[in-house]
C-alpha cells in the first residue's frame, strides 16, 4: 500500500467522503499515518 503523503491524503479524503465527514476532529492527513487505513 502506498504510504506517501499524497496517497495518505487521497485515502483520507475517500474515507471522509464515505463516512459523511463524521470522524474525529484530529483525523487529518498530517495527524494520521498509513497504519490508520
Amino acid at each position: 500500500s502506498c504510504n506517501t503523503a499524497t496517497c495518505v491524503t487521497h485515502r483520507l479524503a475517500g474515507l471522509l467522503s464515505r463516512s459523511g465527514g463524521v470522524v474525529k476532529d484530529n483525523f487529518v492527513p498530517t495527524n494520521v499515518g498509513s497504519e490508520a487505513f
Epitope: T4, T6, H10, T30
Partner: antibody, heavy 119, light 107 residues
Amino acid sequence: EVQLVQSGAEVKKPGASVKVSCKASGYTFTDYYMNWVRQAPGQRLEWIGDINPNNVGTNYNQKFKGRATLTVDKSASTAYMELSSLRSEDTAVYYCASIIIVPNYFDYWGQGTTVTVSS
Amino acid sequence: DIQMTQSPSSLSASVGDRVTITCKASQNVDTNVAWFQQKPGKSPKALIYSASYRYSGVPSRFSGSGSGTDFTLTISSLQPEDFATYYCQQYNNYPYTFGGGTKVEIK
C-alpha cells in the same frame, strides 16, 4: 477561499542562497502537507520535497538533499523553501502546492516564484 | 526514481476533436497518478487524481484511466480553453516524478 501566496521574484549570484515563502490562507495550515515543485525554462516539473507542518517532518528528493531545506512558521501559516549553493541550472519557477480536503477537495498551487541565478 | 514517459510530446488538434495523451511509468505505480494542465506563464492546474477521479470543477470532457504502468488522459471534445501543456505525475513512490509534458496546439 483557499490561497497560497508566494514571495516575489529573486535574482541571485552563483553560490548564494534563496529563501522562498508561501503564505497559506482559507484552511487549517497544519492539517495538510505542503509540496515544493520547480520548473526550469522549457523543462518538466520537478518535485523538490514535502513537509508536514504539524510535526515538521520532511521528505526530500535526493537530488536536492543537503541543498534544499523546507521549514514552516505555524503561527504565520507560512511554508519556506531555502535552496543553497545556487548554480545557473537552478534558474526556475518555484511553486508550493497542497492537496486540501476541507473546505474544498482540490490540489492548490501558489502563483510561482521566479528565481534567476546569474553572475 | 520512477520515470514517467509521456507521448506524444506535442500534437495539433481542432476544436471538437477527441484527444488522447498517454503516460508510461517505468515501474508499477498502482493508480497513484495525477494529471495537470498548464498554460504559459501560469501555475499547473490539477485535473485528475488516483488515475481516474476528476477534481471538483473539472469539466466532464476530461477523463483518466489506467493502472500499473500505463495511463491515459482523454479530452472527449477539445475546447478552445484546452490548448495547453498536460503533465502526468506519479505519487506512489518518493520522489514524485512528472512526465515530460504534452503540448496540445491548434491545428
